[in-house]
């Protein structure tokens, strides 16, 4: 099925979803190692079988990842390689999602209740906004289809809503700084202790200085994952989640807490 989709000259949103599902065998939300090599092989075979040339995007993709076993791509990168229908592709090419900081600001706008989730209705509005910003309008049926597909693509724990880390897969892998924090997330108890101890003035939120101190310590403890030279970027991205410079417990938890105790 996925192979026949790869032969198409234009891939629909639902076909794109099937292709992704087929190659992301472990359901990690990324294609890496064997998964990525399988995709490249099948893509080359499919285009050859259909008598289609590789597009410039496909060519540079194969050049970049064909000979590497350390490659890793997300949904965004794949959407740029495959000839996907325009409106769906726009969701991955949105200006608001070009940088992590912009993404965080967008998240803050839609996660209005600071619940740490964007639910179906909020997601629909989010996608509608993205398309409108690109001067595109889609009918409600198409919008519902896109919303459903986005949930299917990103909702890795199948709870019918998107967490920040799930939604962040809309970002190119290189831009997705949240990935760096995945390996160093604290359990709920540790996170609460850190939040309390770094909230120097006890006002119930973390300000930029307190975040700076916390991040410097995290970089010191996790040199493999975090680079102290990138602290300004980390800080800027995380502060984009704040409410007028106030980073509340639930907001910081999105980045640093694994949730359980």
């Amino acid at each position: 099925m996925a192979e026949s989709h790869l032969q198409s000259s234009l891939i629909t949103a639902s076909q794109f979803f099937e292709i992704w599902l087929h190659f992301d065998a472990d359901g990690s939300g990324y294609l890496e190692g064997k998964e990525l090599q399988n995709l490249i092989q099948e893509l080359l075979q499919a285009r050859k079988k259909a008598g289609l040339e590789l597009s410039p995007e496909m060519k540079s993709f194969v050049d970049q990842y064909g000979q590497r076993d350390d490659g890793k791509i997300g949904i965004v990168e794949l959407a740029h390689v495959l000839p996907t229908e325009e409106n769906f592709l726009l969701l991955f090419r949105c200006q608001q999602l070009k940088s992590c900081e912009e993404f965080m600001k967008t998240w803050r706008k839609y996660d209005t209740d600071h619940s740490g989730f964007i639910e179906t209705e909020e997601l629909k509005n989010f996608l509608k906004d993205l398309l409108e910003k690109a001067n595109k309008t889609v009918d409600d049926t198409k919008l519902a289809e896109y919303t459903d597909l986005m949930l299917k693509l990103f909702d890795s724990n199948n709870d019918g809503k998107l967490e920040l880390t799930e939604m962040a897969r809309l970002l190119p892998v290189q831009e997705n700084f949240l990935l760096k924090f995945q390996g160093i997330k604290m359990c709920g108890k540790e996170f609460n202790k850190a939040f309390e101890l770094y909230d120097q003035d006890g006002n119930g939120y973390i300000d930029e200085n307190e975040l700076d101190a916390l991040l410097k310590d995290l970089c010191e403890k996790n040199k493999q994952e975090l680079d102290i030279n990138n602290i300004t970027t980390y800080k800027k991205n995380i502060m984009a989640l704040s409410d007028g410079g106030k980073l509340y417990r639930t907001d910081l938890a999105l980045i640093l807490s694994a949730g359980d105790n």
Partner: antibody, heavy 117, light 111 residues
Framework: QGQMQQSGAELVKPGASVKLSCKTS????????ISWLKQKPGQSLEWIAW????????NYNQKFTGKAQLTVDTSSSTAYMQFSSLTAEDSAIYYC??????????WGQGTTLTVSS | DIVLTQSPASLPVSLGQRATISCRAS??????????MHWYQHKPGQPPKLLIY???NLESGVPARFSGSGSGTDFTLNIHPVEEEDAATYYC?????????FGGGTKLEIK
Amino acid sequence: QGQMQQSGAELVKPGASVKLSCKTSGFTFSSSYISWLKQKPGQSLEWIAWIYAGTGDTNYNQKFTGKAQLTVDTSSSTAYMQFSSLTAEDSAIYYCARHKYRYLDYWGQGTTLTVSS
Amino acid sequence: DIVLTQSPASLPVSLGQRATISCRASKSVSTSGYSYMHWYQHKPGQPPKLLIYLASNLESGVPARFSGSGSGTDFTLNIHPVEEEDAATYYCQHTRELPWTFGGGTKLEIK
């Protein structure tokens, strides 16, 4: 183990200003807060203010706003407190102390300030 | 500002006995499962030394004869058994909110 070395005793005239220093070592200065505290003879301690060494941002006890001014020099890991418009009331021992979290774990040895004509 | 009242102001104790110092806050200094009360030992000519942080945690290098307890508004520092070198003034301090304040101090004397 962190260390904080404060400047020597000062004898100054009323109305003058004085700048006390606190040179630190043995811990990461840029992710620490440095607080300054006052102790008059036979009395308890009073928290004056803190400065976050990473950015130079400050937080003052209202009582000392306009009286104390805190700065840092990150290149030498040194914190400073300038005390202005001195009166006899300002005669005291002044301590600098570090807090990474919400308690003062390293202290300087103290600087005695005497304001007298 | 939160006012901390320490008692007694002076405490004569015999060697090997227990010394109990109390600190009462004018409002709760506990929140989110933490109590922002700390204890310091101060000897003449030396800087204060952190003994106990967050009500009951012993600072590293401090002998186990020192212990702290309490939550909300009432806190206690216990020293048992008291040794000669424990003669000093002890202060409680809160960091629940700004400004941070200290208790008036308790002078421990060895009888």
